[in-house]
């Protein structure tokens, strides 16, 4: 069961896995959640009754029964991990801790104007886990305004002490605020010959890359496939680092694959969720339970529902045995990965999906779409919303996209004639406009945020955010779309779709059923040739067929240009402008979302 509240003056007895230092009980709970085995924790707050060397200790605990005996102890704060909870989890921690010095390896010292600048520096430094900043009131003159960037093996401080006039905080990489490049490529037949900080077993290079991403010290990795000549190293995932942050040497070796941590792409691709099944593969580990199951999918469900289960192996039933049910072996290990991986035994293995809630909701696979045709089916574009105005009468105004549980991204030009957010209604999970009746539930709009530089669509900056009055509960029919990663600027998207209820020709009316059209992207150089009287900037992106025929039109404005990349849908464009609709050699012009990711995050993550 999910228990979120913290237990004051309470200590859990026994079950210790490890001790780390955290600046608050709240952060201790996050660390426990992300630890492969931690289910409960006890944090010691600063207190005159406690030995200062025990202040800020966060003891991570495990228990077969999922609970431990409680003992009263002043200054102790205990609680449960969020593993038991179904809600979205994030490691993003923007808190600044006043008068705390978080100890680690001080590898970089520089002058900064403010703690915020120091935190930004940490966020944009590949090695930095946390920082301490000496304020201008710091007693020692030569240390004032000094920003110390720090890292540790665990990503958490080695100790935390009280120190007047300093502030500390964590890197905001996990908040998707880093400007570091997102390098998704996996390099075949390549070994990175740098120092290993850890090694785990993984079924493929993708899982290895994801493990590297959420390992605090891993910057890149090398994976030896099951065809690797040295048997003892098959399926070995080597987690690596280097001083420069880049591999120093690349060696060409067959059957090895290498790649980079996806730390800077975390908000737009799954890094915790290993959802694939591995056929003819057995995962070895500590056995938690053996249960009968109808299929490997059922076995994965059982593992996901068992809070201590990390991975499983399913052995299909021998003909007519046990009512056709196979054996489902629920397993765990100290680090969440199999201790060994064996092939050729007929098992089907996989991982718990419990960790999927640590990934951005937008990375969840949606049900397969019907290709061809122009009318969409229910749940095909679950991020698409219809924005209505109620003044002077209620009508569809524009499209928009869910990008967070309280945020809609749309076009600025949609708000011509909108005097106040009070007249707006956002409807999600809608296929047909005719579904919208008096009593249909909608989201009210709390705030309209227009880009400061917007003047008219043709000049760019045609982007706006709507902050909703209430939060969206994600379901199959309403869920967010991922923003593109800043590190993905060079990705060539080939599977792009424009959707909306807009006109199907220049003189028309709003359509009842959500329409879709697959449209190829056009280079900005090509687009500029088609719009000689306009300036097509890098903040715009164009899409269309040379011969015309398929395009967004009036009423589609603000809606998404959605592109599928690596099995994840990304919001590449916002329908903005174009000469006419679907005209020959007149592509549609869209707001290039990747160029506004910083703006979006600044506005949506403002405290």
């Amino acid at each position: 069961e999910c228990v979120t509240q913290l237990l004051k003056d309470t200590c859990f007895e026994g079950g210790d896995i490890t001790t780390v230092f955290t600046p608050s009980a709240k952060y201790c709970q996050v660390v426990c959640t992300y630890h492969p085995r931690c289910l409960l924790f006890t944090f010691t707050a600063e207190s005159p009754s406690e030995d200062p060397t025990r202040w800020f200790t966060c003891v991570l605990k495990d228990s077969v029964t999922e609970t431990l005996p409680r003992v009263n102890r002043t200054a102790a704060i205990s609680g449960y991990s969020f593993k038991q909870c179904s809600h979205q989890i994030s490691a993003c921690n923007k808190d600044i801790y006043v008068d705390l010095d978080m100890k680690g390896i001080n590898y970089n010292s520089s002058v900064a104007k403010s703690a915020q600048e120091c935190q930004e520096r940490c966020t944009d430094d590949v090695h930095c886990h946390f920082f301490t900043y000496a304020t201008r009131q710091f007693p020692s003159l030569e240390h004032r305004n000094i920003c110390l960037l720090k890292h540790t093996q665990t990503g958490t401080p080695t100790r935390i002490t009280k120190l007047d006039k300093v502030v500390s905080g964590f890197s905001l990489k996990s908040c998707a605020l880093s400007n570091l490049a997102c390098i998704r490529d996996i390099f075949p037949n390549t070994v990175f010959a740098d120092s290993n900080i850890d090694s785990v077993m993984a079924p493929d290079a993708f899982v290895c890359g994801r493990i590297c991403t959420h390992h605090p010290g891993c910057l890149f990795f090398t994976f030896f496939s099951q065809e690797w000549p040295k048997e003892s190293q098959r399926n070995l995932c080597l987690l690596k680092t280097s001083e420069s942050g880049l591999p120093s040497t690349r060696i060409k070796k067959s059957k090895a694959l290498s790649g980079f941590s996806l730390q800077s792409c975390r908000h737009s691709i799954p890094v915790f969720c290993h959802s694939s099944f591995y056929h003819d593969t057995d995962f070895l580990g500590e056995e938690l339970d053996i249960v009968a199951a109808k299929s490997h999918e059922a076995c994965q469900k059982l593992c996901t529902n068992a809070v201590r289960c990390q991975f499983f192996t399913y052995t299909p039933a021998q003909a007519s045995c046990n009512e056709g049910k196979g054996k489902c072996y629920l397993k765990l290990s100290s680090n969440g990965s199999p201790t060994k991986i064996l092939h050729g035994r007929g098992g089907i293995s996989g991982y718990t999906l419990r960790l999927c809630k640590m990934d951005n909701e937008c990375t969840t696979k949606i049900k397969p779409r019907i290709v061809g045709g122009t009318a969409s089916v229910r749940g095909e574009w679950p991020w698409q919303v219809t924005l209505h105005t109620t003044s002077p009468t209620q009508r569809h105004l524009c499209g928009g996209s869910i990008i967070g549980n309280q945020w809609i991204l749309t076009a600025a030009h949609c708000f011509y004639g909108v005097e106040s957010p009070k007249i707006l209604r956002v409807y999600s999970g809608i296929l047909n406009q005719s579904e919208i009746k008096e009593d249909t539930s909608f989201f009210g709009v709390q705030e309209i945020i227009i880009h400061d530089q917007y003047k008219m669509a043709e000049s760019g900056y045609d982007i706006a955010l709507l902050k909703l009055e209430t939060t969206v509960n994600y379901t199959d029919s309403q869920r967010p779309i991922c923003l593109p990663s800043k590190g993905d600027r060079n990705v060539i998207y080939t599977d792009c779709w424009v959707t909306g209820w807009g006109y199907r020709k220049l003189r028309d009316k709003i359509q009842n059923t959500l329409q879709k059209a697959k449209i190829p992207l056009v280079t900005n150089e090509e687009c500029q040739k088609r719009y000689r009287g306009h300036k097509i900037t890098h903040k715009m992106i164009c899409a269309g067929y040379r011969e015309g025929g398929k395009d967004a039109c009036k009423g589609d404005s603000g809606g998404p240009l959605s592109c599928k990349h690596n099995e994840v849908w990304h919001l590449v464009g916002i329908t903005s402008w174009g000469e006419g609709c679907a005209q020959r050699e007149r592509p549609g012009v869209y707001t290039n979302v990747v160029e506004y990711v910083d703006w979006i995050l600044e506005k949506t993550q403002a405290v």
Epitope: H413, I450, D452, Y454, M456
Partner: antibody
Framework: QVTLKESGPVLVKPTETLTLTCTVS????????VAWIRQPPGKALEWLAE???????SYNSRLKSRLTISKDTSKSQVVLTMTNMDPVDTATYYC????????????WGQGTLVTVSS | DIVMTQTPLSLSVTPGQPASISCRSS???????????LEWYLQKPGQSPQLLIY???NRFSGVPDRFSGSGSGTDFTLKISRVEAEDVGVYYC?????????FGQGTKLEIK
């Protein structure tokens, strides 16, 4: 609530420079653009200039060389200067604010009558 | 610049009767973003102008439904279905599709 109030000289001499101030309340100049519009006695409205949220400016092309629009967001003021005034510039000068975007103009000042005469 | 031409320049109407004002632009006002930035304002005697219609045909909240706007491209019309005494003043069309923005020369409505 939203208010705009124009202020400046009632009388200016020909060739002089007119400086008008629009003081706003109930909203921030970093979130909305403001325009100046004038109306000679018994004649039509004429759009003069706009200052956008980000400080960019747009001008009536016929009068562009004579106009400068600026703002001081902290003081909630928009200033219009018009050089080389002429009796034909005698008019009521209004400042106005749009809704969410630059137009339509929903909020208007009450206007200030400027007479150009020696 | 876009020139806005209104006709007639003045009109005298009996209360309860309809009135119609035409506004023609020198270029199409249909913006490439799908909006048509054409607005109608009424300036009552001794007052600042007030918004009636935006986007060709959208009545601003609080504006009586006897006012309606129509048109597309370069030809636009403001209609008053039944004129009332309080409708007297000067009516202006205004375009914000192309910078610099421009007003029509105004149409004075009087009551017979």
């Amino acid at each position: 609530q939203v208010t705009l109030k124009e202020s400046g000289p009632v009388l200016v001499k020909p060739t002089e420079t007119l400086t008008l101030t629009c003081t706003v309340s109930g909203f921030s100049l970093s979130s909305y653009s403001v325009a100046w519009i004038r109306q000679p006695p018994g004649k039509a409205l004429e759009w003069l200039a706009e200052i956008w949220r980000d400080g960019d400016t747009s001008y009536n092309s016929r009068l562009k060389s004579r106009l400068t629009i600026s703002k001081d967001t902290s003081k909630s003021q928009v200033v219009l200067t018009m050089t080389n005034m002429d009796p034909v510039d005698t008019a009521t000068y209004y400042c106005a604010r749009g809704m969410t975007l630059a137009t339509p103009f929903l909020y208007w000042g009450q206007g200030t009558l400027v007479t150009v005469s020696s | 610049d876009i020139v806005m031409t209104q006709t007639p320049l003045s009109l005298s109407v009996t209360p309860g009767q309809p009135a119609s004002i035409s506004c023609r632009s020198s270029q199409s006002l249909e913006s490439s973003d799908g909006n048509t930035y054409l607005e109608w304002y009424l300036q009552k005697p001794g007052q600042s102008p007030q918004l009636l219609i935006y986007g060709v045909s959208n009545r601003f909240s609080g504006v009586p439904d006897r006012f309606s706007g129509s048109g597309s491209g370069t030809d636009f019309t403001l209609k008053i279905s039944r004129v009332e005494a309080e409708d007297v003043g000067v009516y202006y069309c205004f375009q914000a599709t192309r910078d610099p923005f421009t007003f029509g020369q105004g149409t004075k409505l009087e009551i017979k």
